[in-house]
């Protein structure tokens, strides 16, 4: 059962796993949620009745019964992890803590104009977990405006003390605000021989990479496959670091794979959710329960629904045995990974899907698309919305994309002459415009946020956000698309599609069925040659065939240019402008979304 509220002056007795330091009870709850075993916690706030050495302690706890006896204690705040909850979870913590010094290894000291600049520096430094900034009121003159970047083994402070005129905070890497590169390549037949901070067992290099991504100290990894010559090291995942942040030593070695933490791209690819099944593979660990199940999928469901289950092994039924049901072994370990992985015993293994809610919803796989044809099918572009105006009569105005449960990203030029958000309606999960009737449910628009540098589509900044009056419940037919990662600026997208209900030729009408067209991206240099009278800036991106024939057109504006990369769809562009439609040597011009990620996050994450 999901309990979100905090229990004041209450302490949970027993069940201790470990103690960490956090600046608030709220953050203690987040740390507990991300810990592989923590189900409950007790935080000690600062209080005259408490020993100062116990202030800010966050004791992570576990219990077989999922609860523990409660004891009254002043200054203690207790609560439950969000593991038991179904809502989306984020580790993003933008809070700034005044008069608190968060202790760690101070590895970098520099002057900064403000705490915000210090936090940005921390966010863009590969090693930084948190920072402390001495304000200009700090008593010691030589320490004023000093920004200390810090890291620890756990990613949380080793101690927190009160200190006047300083502020502390965390890196915003988990808020998708880092400019660090996102290197997704996995290098075959390569060992990184740098320092190991931990080792775990993993079924493949992808899981190893995801484990590295959410391990606070891991910057890159090496994985020994099941064909690795040394049996005792098969399926071993080595989590690594180095002073420079990059591997200093790459050695060619067959049956090993290496790669990098995906910390800088974690909002646009799954890093917690290990959804694959591993056939003829047994995961060893502490047994939680053995249950009868019809299939390995059913076994995974059982594991996902058992809050303490981390992974499972399913042994299929022997013929005509136990009504065709196999055995489902629900398991756990201290770090969330199997203690050993065995092959050739006939088991089917996998992980709980409970952690999937820690990933961005936009990374969820959607159903396979229909190749060929121009009409879309239901659920093919679940982020696409149709934006209607009701004035003077109701009609389709523009496209848009769901990027969050209360947010639509679209083009600024759609709102020319729109005086009030009250006349707007957002319809999601729509394939045919004819589905929209008087009684069709829609989302009202609470606010239109247009980029303040927008003047006209051709001069750029053609981007706007719609804040919805109510939240979108994600389903197969309405779900968000990922924003591109700032670290992905150099990615060459090859699978890009433009969608919309717009005209199919210059003089036409709005289409009934959502149309789709696969369109290649064009370099900005090439695009500039085609539009000599305009300035094609880096904040624009172009797409189109040299010979024309496929393009966005009137009515598609504001809709997505969606590109698939590493099995995840990204909102690379927003349909903005072009000369005519599908004309030869006149590519469509789109708002280059990656250049506006900071703006989007600033507006959507504002408190």
């Amino acid at each position: 059962e999901c309990v979100t509220q905090l229990l004041k002056d209450t302490c949970f007795e027993g069940g201790d796993i470990t103690t960490v330091f956090t600046p608030s009870a709220k953050y203690c709850q987040v740390v507990c949620t991300y810990h592989p075993r923590c189900l409950l916690f007790t935080f000690t706030a600062e209080s005259p009745s408490e020993d100062p050495t116990r202030w800010f302690t966050c004791v992570l706890k576990d219990s077989v019964t999922e609860t523990l006896p409660r004891v009254n204690r002043t200054a203690a705040i207790s609560g439950y992890s969000f593991k038991q909850c179904s809502h989306q979870i984020s580790a993003c913590n933008k809070d700034i803590y005044v008069d608190l010094d968060m202790k760690g290894i101070n590895y970098n000291s520099s002057v900064a104009k403000s705490a915000q600049e210090c936090q940005e520096r921390c966010t863009d430094d590969v090693h930084c977990h948190f920072f402390t900034y001495a304000t200009r009121q700090f008593p010691s003159l030589e320490h004023r405006n000093i920004c200390l970047l810090k890291h620890t083994q756990t990613g949380t402070p080793t101690r927190i003390t009160k200190l006047d005129k300083v502020v502390s905070g965390f890196s915003l890497k988990s808020c998708a605000l880092s400019n660090l590169a996102c290197i997704r390549d996995i290098f075959p037949n390569t060992v990184f021989a740098d320092s190991n901070i931990d080792s775990v067992m993993a079924p493949d290099a992808f899981v190893c990479g995801r484990i590295c991504t959410h391990h606070p100290g891991c910057l890159f990894f090496t994985f020994f496959s099941q064909e690795w010559p040394k049996e005792s090291q098969r399926n071993l995942c080595l989590l690594k670091t180095s002073e420079s942040g990059l591997p200093s030593t790459r050695i060619k070695k067959s049956k090993a794979l290496s790669g990098f933490s995906l910390q800088s791209c974690r909002h646009s690819i799954p890093v917690f959710c290990h959804s694959s099944f591993y056939h003829d593979t047994d995961f060893l660990g502490e047994e939680l329960d053995i249950v009868a199940a019809k299939s390995h999928e059913a076994c995974q469901k059982l594991c996902t629904n058992a809050v303490r289950c981390q992974f499972f092994t399913y042994t299929p039924a022997q013929a005509s045995c136990n009504e065709g049901k196999g055995k489902c072994y629900l398991k756990l370990s201290s770090n969330g990974s199997p203690t050993k992985i065995l092959h050739g015993r006939g088991g089917i293994s996998g992980y709980t899907l409970r952690l999937c809610k820690m990933d961005n919803e936009c990374t969820t796989k959607i159903k396979p698309r229909i190749v060929g044809g121009t009409a879309s099918v239901r659920g093919e572009w679940p982020w696409q919305v149709t934006l209607h105006t009701t004035s003077p009569t109701q009609r389709h105005l523009c496209g848009g994309s769901i990027i969050g449960n209360q947010w639509i990203l679209t083009a600024a030029h759609c709102f020319y002459g729109v005086e009030s958000p009250k006349i707007l309606r957002v319809y999601s999960g729509i394939l045919n415009q004819s589905e929209i009737k008087e009684d069709t449910s829609f989302f009202g628009v609470q606010e239109i946020i247009i980029h303040d540098q927008y003047k006209m589509a051709e001069s750029g900044y053609d981007i706007a956000l719609l804040k919805l009056e109510t939240t979108v419940n994600y389903t197969d037919s309405q779900r968000p698309i990922c924003l591109p990662s700032k670290g992905d600026r150099n990615v060459i997208y090859t699978d890009c599609w433009v969608t919309g209900w717009g005209y199919r030729k210059l003089r036409d009408k709005i289409q009934n069925t959502l149309q789709k067209a696969k369109i290649p991206l064009v370099t900005n240099e090439e695009c500039q040659k085609r539009y000599r009278g305009h300035k094609i800036t880096h904040k624009m991106i172009c797409a189109g065939y040299r010979e024309g024939g496929k393009d966005a057109c009137k009515g598609d504006s504001g809709g997505p240019l969606s590109c698939k990369h590493n099995e995840v769809w990204h909102l690379v562009g927003i349909t903005s402008w072009g000369e005519g439609c599908a004309q030869r040597e006149r590519p469509g011009v789109y708002t280059n979304v990656v250049e506006y990620v900071d703006w989007i996050l600033e507006k959507t994450q504002a408190v």
Epitope: F192, N196, I197, P229, L238, K240
Partner: nanobody, 126 residues
Amino acid sequence: QVQLVESGGGLVQPGGSLRLSCTASEFTFDDSDMAWYRQAPGNECELVSTITSDGGTYYADSVKGRFTISQDNSKNTMYLQMNSLRAEDTAVYYCAADQWGSAEGDCTSSYPGGYWGQGTLVTVSS
């Protein structure tokens, strides 16, 4: 019980040479990746050289052209021939088997199936 024993360390003048040996017991070199690591006082453990089971060799940039790694499988022994020694080569040298990287900067075992010797001190000083 796997044991790796280093020998050959000592005091040598700058420009001099030393040959380190590492002998293994309860363990065969044939299918193992062997390496020499070193740790100078106050520094992290660093990889000096590796010889892989398929005969490939690797050298850290700082020792390239001066150090040579080799092994004699019949004697279950690995060697590090160190020439043109410099003051900055002063460190404790460790022999390691199937050990790809140190444990958080220290020359100690960090994961299953990896082994370390006790180390031998090399001092380069005039």
